[in-house]
């Protein structure tokens, strides 16, 4: 039940041992009580004891004191449990009876006689305090007290509030006197089922399943989950946001696995050879004469240095070598010639000059050729002139150094720090990436250098008709209307349905003219594209000669670092496919979409953990397909900007990045 009415019998006095009918009990009145508790009645009437009834065993003869007894027969106080909301009012009938029979169950005995009865009507609030009373009539006196208390787990003024203390998965609390929950230490929430995490545990990056715990969400670590975890493939780098790989000093490459100071750290070159921090392994050894091998670890034979000139063949001898000269040559190294200009000894277009009155000659070689007979092609890369891992390329009469990202100069000797010239306008934050600066713009600005002030949302004016969906375009003032079935036009303003009398002839002529016009435009574009297209080698050769402005328009794969979920990047450049491609498994930083930050949409969320992506709020485009590939259309290769579609970490959502 929800509560208990308790009645404590204290003393009964019947000095003369009389019954209610005036007769006396023989030998004395063996007294027991019947109690009936019912709803409040102004006039007590017979009928069921609606709130409960109880009988006692024989408690004494004539006059006696009733002792408290907690268990067994004759329990005192008497308990009348109820299973409803206590109304606050009641009627109580206490009857004293005499039994000639059984002491323990006298109510069932025949020949019982009423001694006296009392009736109490009134109000009674739930509480622990006993209300004491005494009732007298001409023959008897009864002293008693009573109260209403709530059963275990029931609380409140009417015992109607159930509260059972618990410490399990569903809650961790005790119950207040009014039935409200009192959370155990370390727990909070309406039902005390939310743990209070370790003090300082990061709100977004951390959570807990029990008090004073701080469990980190993917990508975060540490006691308070406020330190990021670098990318899985990262070798010598750190991070400022999860899965980043920012190289430690002296390391380079996408995963910071290229030692920019390999020579100093490892001294790989042997036998006095020269080490330079370049080449595919991060270093190159230039051997002294008489040594070879990747690390100049192998001693050469005496002939290894090719001492015989003019095609002479070398023979190793014990401590030296011997040159066997071809016809027309003599000397220790076959360096002297018996030929003259008359014998046309100069190869590869070399011109012959007579010397010593015609007894010998000298060849003047064209560019790219050398040797006494212009027989050798010049290799200008043998001296490893390119620093910092630059690649040397022979280019006709000269050579060029193709620098690794982050370096410039004729020999790649200069390190680029693009942020030094403060390229970001309007308080934008500059990030010095390997392939140039990237600006993170404050709210209200966009563009490569945060130079564009975002004026308004082009969709705010509701430009699309007939229930079409409006999407903001790639610049703040652009919009695109997605028309419902049956409507066309840039604003979906034209219905597709045909009118009853249709002017077929006029329409046919119109359509024909449009088709001709489209074909003409396609021919012009194709011709223009063919004229623009250059061979691969030529464009590669031009790489080092690009202006800074043009270089900024290139998107090297290594620059595309993503600190989130890595999806694929599609760039669609209209008809000119030569400058397009899909960059797969490369990663993109949020910062590559600076122009869109702070415009519409919700911050990215993990589904069950509120993992926020920070203050950056990218524009969202809905996509039907889970793989979500949206290609932004960009202009041909002579355009100023390339537009890029960045596939975000969320399922079914896209972010458009502009002006990379």
């Amino acid at each position: 039940g929800s509560g208990i009415f308790q009645l404590r019998l204290q003393e009964f006095v019947n000095q003369r041992g009389m019954l209610a009918n005036g007769q006396s009990c023989e030998p004395g009145c063996r007294t027991f009580f019947r109690i009936c508790l019912k709803h409040f009645q102004a006039t007590f009437s017979e009928g069921p004891c609606t709130f409960g009834n109880v009988s006692t065993p024989v408690l004494g003869t004539n006059s006696f004191v009733v002792r408290d007894k907690n268990s067994g027969s004759g329990r005192n106080p008497l308990q009348l449990p109820f299973n409803f909301t206590w109304p606050g009012t009641f009627s109580l009938n206490i009857q004293a009876w005499h039994t000639p029979g059984d002491d323990l169950r006298p109510e069932t005995s025949p020949g019982n006689s009423l001694i006296s009865q009392i009736i109490i009507q009134g109000s009674l609030a739930v509480g622990k305090i006993w209300r004491t009373d005494e009732q007298n009539d001409t023959l008897t006196r009864l002293s008693y007290s009573y109260r209403v208390i709530c059963s275990d787990n029931y609380y409140g003024e009417s015992c109607s509030r159930l509260c059972k203390k618990r410490d399990d998965h569903f809650g961790h609390y005790e119950c207040q006197p009014d039935g409200s929950l009192s959370c155990l230490p370390g727990w909070t929430g309406k039902y005390c089922d939310q743990p209070i995490c370790l003090s300082g545990c990061h709100e977004q990056n951390g959570y807990c399943s029990k008090p004073d715990e701080c469990i980190c969400r993917p990508g975060w670590q540490g006691r308070l989950c406020n330190e990021c975890i670098p990318h899985n493939g990262c070798r010598h780098g750190t991070c400022s946001i999860p899965w980043q790989c920012a190289c430690d000093e002296g390391w380079g490459g996408l995963f910071c696995d290229q030692d920019l100071n390999y020579c100093t750290h490892h001294s790989p070159c042997k036998n006095g050879s020269t080490c330079s921090n370049s080449g595919p392994k991060g270093y190159t050894c230039t051997c002294l004469p008489g040594y070879t091998g990747e690390h100049c670890e192998l001693g050469l034979s005496k002939c290894a240095s090719n001492p015989c000139r003019n095609g002479g063949s070398c023979k190793d001898q014990e401590n030296s070598y011997h040159c066997l000269c071809p016809p027309g040559y003599y000397g220790q190294h076959c360096e002297h010639s018996t030929l003259t200009c008359a014998d046309s000894p100069c190869f590869n277009g070399g011109s012959c000059r007579e010397r010593n009155q015609g007894s010998s000659y000298a060849c003047e070689c064209p560019p790219n050729f050398t040797g006494s007979n212009c027989e050798k092609k010049v290799d200008r890369c043998t001296s490893n002139p390119c620093a910092n891992g630059g690649q040397c390329q022979n280019r006709g009469p000269s050579r060029t150094c193709r620098c690794r990202p982050g370096f410039t100069g004729t020999h790649c000797e200069l390190h680029i720090s693009d942020c030094a010239r403060s390229p970001c306008a309007h308080g934008g934050t500059c990030h010095d990436l390997e392939n140039g600066p990237v600006c993170t713009c404050p709210a209200g600005f966009s563009g490569r250098r945060c130079e564009v002030r975002i004026t308004h949302d082009a969709c705010a004016s509701g430009p699309c008709f007939n229930g079409a969906t409006c999407y903001t375009g790639l610049s703040p003032n652009n919009f695109v209307c997605n028309c419902p079935y049956g409507f066309v036009g840039s604003r979906c303003e034209f219905p597709v349905g045909l009118p009853p009398s249709f002017p077929w002839v006029a329409v046919s002529l119109g359509v024909g003219l449009v088709v001709l016009l489209v074909l003409l435009v396609m021919v012009v574009v194709a011709v223009r594209q063919l004229r623009l297209r250059r061979p691969d080698d030529e464009s590669r050769e031009a790489m080092n000669n690009l202006s800074d402005f043009q270089k900024d328009n290139l998107i090297p794969a290594a620059q595309l670092k993503n600190t989130n979920q890595k999806k694929e990047l599609e760039v669609d450049c209209g008809l000119d496919k030569s400058n397009c491609g899909k960059l797969q498994n490369h990663t993109l930083d949020y910062n590559l979409a600076p122009g869109l930050l702070g415009r519409g949409g919700m911050p990215g969320k993990y589904p069950h953990s509120d993992k926020s992506l920070g203050e950056k709020v990218p524009l969202r485009l809905h996509s039907e397909k889970p793989e979500c590939r949206i290609s932004a259309i960009c202009s041909p290769r002579d355009s100023m900007y390339q537009s890029v579609c960045l596939i975000s970490e969320e399922r079914n959502e896209c972010v458009i990045a502009t002006e990379v």
């Epitope: 993917p218 006691r223 990262c234 010598h236």
Partner: antibody, heavy 118, light 107 residues
Framework: EVQLVESGGGLVQPGGSLRLSCAAS????????MAWVRQAPGKGLEWVAT????????YYRDSVKGRFTISRDNAKNSLYLQMNSLRAEDTAVYYC???????????WGQGTLVTVSS | DIQMTQSPSSLSASVGDRVTITCRAS??????LAWYQQKPGKSPKLLIF???DLADGVPSRFSGSGSGTDFTLTISSLQPEDFATYYC?????????FGQGTKLEIK
């Protein structure tokens, strides 16, 4: 090349102790969280413990809490697992791995066998 | 703990075959799932992380897909060196848990 080399495994009686070591090279050890993962003979993989790179915060699977202690020495590029009160069910090949409890394990050592038997 | 259930537990295939292994999580783990390859007597090797991202140096014939509770590892054209045991692992909840493994054998 990233290399993780475990040592310290062997035969030990139930209730005994063992200390496993892992020597790391080929990456900046102090920048990365580390873990121990074990594999009982003929069974699957089971994460044992993790330590963060930054402040040395540690986490353990319930069955080893209070018995195992993971630690690291960034100056020595080393990871350790102190195993006390060993039980028969701790018998496994113990792998040192680079990763946290909430990230994939990108690199693994060759493993060291711990046998708990009387 | 999150239970990871792989199916099948073993499978036989031939060189050149397209093979699919599935992994089911007992709760939503978003995309925080990795796949590993383990050859007898060797340590596991990370193949795929974040459900579909290839680890460094892993051939493109391996691919992953899925999200939430159901995930798939696909090998588009089996090579002789691909015969091994494959494990999935979730790292969305503590403790991180692995699947029981799928043994890929030569038919």
């Amino acid at each position: 090349e990233v290399q993780l080399v475990e040592s310290g495994g062997g035969l030990v009686q139930p209730g005994g102790s063992l200390r496993l070591s892992c020597a790391a090279s080929g990456f900046t050890f102090s920048n990365f969280p580390m873990a121990w993962v074990r594999q009982a003979p003929g069974k699957g993989l089971e994460w044992v413990a993790t330590i963060s790179s930054s402040d040395g915060t540690t986490y353990y699977r319930d069955s080893v809490k209070g018995r195992f202690t993971i630690s690291r020495d960034n100056a020595k590029n080393s990871l350790y697992l102190q195993m006390n009160s060993l039980r028969a069910e701790d018998t496994a090949v113990y792998y040192c791995a680079r990763g946290y409890y909430n990230s994939p394990f990108a690199y693994w050592g060759q493993g060291t066998l711990v046998t708990v038997s009387s | 703990d999150i239970q990871m259930t792989q199916s099948p537990s073993s499978l036989s295939a031939s060189v050149g075959d397209r093979v699919t292994i599935t992994c089911r999580a007992s709760q939503d783990i978003y995309i925080n799932l990795a796949w590993y390859q383990q050859k007898p007597g060797k340590s596991p090797k990370l193949l795929i992380f974040d459900t579909n991202d290839l680890a460094d140096g892993v051939p493109s014939r391996f691919s992953g897909s899925g999200s939430g509770t159901d995930f798939t590892l696909t090998i588009s054209s089996l090579q002789p060196e691909d015969f091994a045991t494959y494990y999935c692992q979730q790292y969305d909840y503590v403790p991180p848990t692995f699947g029981q493994g799928t043994k890929l054998e030569i038919k």
